[in-house]
Every structure is written in C-alpha cells, then in structure tokens.
C-alpha cells in the first residue's frame, strides 16, 4: 500500500529530524546566548474572565497563553515545514521561565493530558501555547462603592532572566494582543469595559526585568 509506506516513511523522517535536533542540544541555555537578546512574543486569548472577589481583592481568569520565540539551534530541513509536538517535547528544549507577578495561584490544565501545544517551524520559530487558570491580585479602592470602577492587572515576565537576556514583546503590537472571547465574561456585579496593555521595567537587586501588563477595566453594574 503506497499510502501506508508514505506514512511510515514520514514517521521515520519525523523521528530522525527530532533526534537530530536534540542531539547536543542543551536546554539550560537560552537561544542566542552570548550573541543576542532572546525575544519572546506573547499574546493572550481570554476564554473566561471572573468571578471577581471584592473581599479578597482578586479575580480569576482562564486564558490561552501563547509565546513565540526563535531558537536557531532548532532549524531543520525536511518534507514538512512544521513539527507539531506534544507537551513532552517542551521539557527537552529551552522554554521561557514566564511567571505571573501578581498571580496568587496559577493552574496549568492537565485533563486529560497537559493542555500544551508546541510547534517548531523549519526556521527555528517555536510556538508554545498553554491553557491556564490564574487567580490574580486586583488592588481595589472601594471608597466610591457602589459607583466604583477598577482596573485589574495581569502581569507576567521572566523569573530569572533580566531585560538584557530575555525581553518580551506583544505579538500583535500593543493594540491587539489581548483578546477576550465574546462570551467570556463571568461577572455578575461588574461590567468588563475593555482592556489595555503595556510593558514595564522593574528594577531589583538582581537587575532589570521586563514586565508585560494587561489591565482589565471593570465598572460596577
């Protein structure tokens, strides 16, 4: 059967490409080490926003968190342009050590398998998508209750790498990188008016770090 042979052949090629990519690959080293800054492009698709707790000053958000970067070590040549891989491959390559600065609790979904997608393009571009639920702090000023409005932030960045090593850029520029699903609001006492995004630099004793920010604007109903 020609089709069967072709499929077997593709699997063999696929395996060979993966083996070759990982041969001598050190996942402790970031792409471009000693040569250039690693740029991580990010965007967020919010599948559900809320509920918001006034008493705990926190909110819950479900997102598809997408990160893209280039790793020249993972360039390949083959009959396919893209290698679609499961979450197991993610532990074998360098991935950004992104964390949520104002996250109280973050859960990466694991049913029925870790909800992660990894794609490698032949030019070494990686797309890493994961489904997360984040419980995040939302500082609130309740003096104007019941006419109050709040801006709940979601802040993320690299845990260990300074701005001179790893920097984050909004994939779709500052205008369009955080989308909320049309049916995404899980709020009963607030209206989600919209969101704005930006970028900050924070200084600490260990250096300067890039912090990406998304603010979700709420107004009490």
């Amino acid at each position: 059967n020609i089709q069967e042979d072709e499929a077997k052949n593709n699997i063999t090629i696929f395996t060979r490409i993966l083996d070759r990519l990982l041969d001598g690959y050190d996942n402790r080293l970031r792409p471009g080490l000693g040569d250039s800054i690693t740029e991580v492009f990010t965007n967020i698709y919010v599948t559900s926003f809320g509920p918001v707790s006034d008493t705990d000053m926190e909110y819950t958000i479900d997102v598809f968190f997408r990160q893209k970067w280039k790793d020249e070590r993972l360039k390949f040549k083959g009959p396919m342009n893209i290698l679609r891989l499961n979450n197991l491959m993610a532990s074998k390559i360098w991935t950004p050590d992104t964390f949520f600065h104002n996250g109280k609790k973050s859960v990466a979904h694991n049913m029925t398998m870790p909800n992660k997608l990894l794609r490698i393009q032949d030019d070494g571009t990686l797309l890493y998508t994961m489904r997360l639920t984040v419980q995040a702090e939302c500082p609130m000023h309740l003096e104007d209750f019941p006419m109050d409005a709040h801006s709940c932030p979601l802040k993320f960045g690299s845990y260990a790498y300074t701005t001179s090593e790893v920097t984050y850029i909004w994939t779709y520029n500052a205008s369009d990188s955080v989308q909320v699903a049309p049916d995404g609001s899980r709020l009963n006492q607030y209206d989600l008016l919209g969101q704005s995004i930006g970028k900050e630099t924070i200084k600490s004793s260990t250096g300067e770090y890039t912090v990406m920010t998304a603010h979700f604007h709420l107004k009490r109903k």
Epitope: E39, F41, Y45, K68, N81, I82, R119, Q121, D122, T125, L127, I169, W170, T171, Y172, N173, A174, S175, D176, Q179, A181, P182, G198, K199
Partner: antibody
Framework: EVQLQQSGAELVKPGASVKLSCTAS????????MYWVKQRPEQGLEWIGR????????KYDPKFQGKATITADTSSNTAYLQLSSLTSEDTAVYYC??????????WGQGTTLTVSS | DIQMTQTTSSLSASLGDRVTISCRAS??????LNWYQQKPDGTVKLLIY???RLHSGVPSRFSGSGSGTDYSLTISNLEQEDIATYFC?????????FGGGTKLEIK
C-alpha cells in the same frame, strides 16, 4: 519558506462584489493573525482589518466596516477578503499580510482590483 | 487614529551614501514602530520591527532608532537594490496606521 500567494487581478462592475484570496505556505495561519491592506494608485497604505484564524475573531478599521468582510479557511490555510457594493473608490491593490513577529512581517504580492463599467 | 507623518516624500541620494528617513507619530507609540520597503514592482517587505529590530534576512546596513513620537530608518551604505518607497507603521493602537511613504531615488 514563508509565502503568501494572492489570487489574480479582478475587473468588476460598480455595485458588484468580489472575493480575494490569500493562501499561506510555510506556516499555519492558525498561529498568526492575517491582515488586509489597501493601496490606491500612487497613494499610501491603509489597514482594512484582520482575522485571528484560530477563532474567527475579526477587527476592522471603522471606515471599512460594512464594505469589507474577512474570513479564513484553516483547512486550506487561506484568508479571504470580500468587498461589496463596489465603486471606483475601491479600485486599488489589495495586499494580505501575516503577523508572526509583532508586525506585518510577510506580504502577498498584491491583487489589483479595478472597478469600471 | 494616530497620524504617521513622513515629511520627506522623495529623497535623492548617491550609491554608497548614508540615508536617513524620518517618521513622526501624532502621539507616543511606545516603540511599536515598524518599517517596510515597497519595490517599484509592488513587492512589500518588512525591514525593521519594534523600532530597531532587524527582520530575518534583512541586510545589516538597515537600522532603526527612535522613541516616543520620533523615529528614523537609516541605510548606512546605499545600494542600487535599495531603490524603493519606505513606509513607517505604528502598532501601538488600533487601527494600525502607515506613514505616507518616502520614495528613494538615485542621484
């Protein structure tokens, strides 16, 4: 290699509609946004709108709202731009572009649309 | 909408020259500024993204700089193949907007 292949030139009558296509190779359109840009003869570039092929979400420049409809077919890795109620003002070159690294980083070769009776 | 202004609509230079093309935004665009090259045959290519990052495959003679509202594209050693129109584009707010273009010609 990333490539965007656009459909051929169109000559259409005023009042008609037209659907332009843009087929991507070398990447999956679900991993990016697809944009459409208009360029009238000897003029600058105008953003029409974009689609997120992963979920079909679209955004348009208000001045193209009602005139343009952007769709995508992920099975054929193709984005489409439909223009309705055509007038001579719609005579232009239409480009599709993809956004992989924070900008319109790959462009199609352009489709010339001529609206004339 | 944010207005993008390229004050020089055409520019004449000699091969080997250093050429600078400027672009001004009507408000702060936080470095979300990209540069494109459009060849006479209509082909459009990204040169620089996020103010100063060189897109893959673009020669290193191209560089970008700027901040706030003022940005520039520099070609350090002009070559014949650089004859084209250059557009800036902001991505800080929707809709993305383009400058009117600067047409580069050989003296």
């Amino acid at each position: 290699e990333v490539q965007l292949q656009q459909s051929g030139a169109e000559l259409v009558k005023p009042g008609a509609s037209v659907k332009l296509s843009c087929t991507a190779s070398g990447f999956n359109i679900k991993d990016t946004y697809m944009y459409w840009v208009k360029q009238r003869p000897e003029q600058g570039l105008e953003w029409i709108g974009r689609i997120d092929p992963a979920n079909g979400n679209t955004k348009y420049d208000p001045k193209f709202q009602g005139k343009a409809t952007i769709t995508a077919d992920t099975s054929s890795n193709t984005a489409y731009l439909q223009l309705s109620s055509l007038t001579s003002e719609d005579t232009a070159v239409y480009y599709c572009a993809s956004n992989y690294y924070g900008s319109f980083d790959y462009w199609g070769q352009g489709t010339t649309l001529t609206v004339s009776s | 909408d944010i207005q993008m202004t390229q004050t020089t609509s055409s520019l004449s230079a000699s091969l080997g020259d250093r050429v600078t093309i400027s672009c001004r935004a009507s408000q702060d665009i936080s470095n979300y500024l990209n540069w494109y090259q459009q060849k006479p045959d209509g082909t459009v290519k990204l040169l620089i993204y996020y103010t100063s990052r060189l897109h893959s495959g673009v020669p290193s003679r191209f560089s970008g700089s700027g901040s706030g509202t003022d940005y520039s594209l520099t070609i350090s050693n002009l070559e014949q193949e650089d004859i084209a129109t250059y557009f800036c584009q902001q991505g800080n707010t929707l809709p993305p907007t383009f400058g009117g273009g600067t047409k580069l010609e050989i003296k």
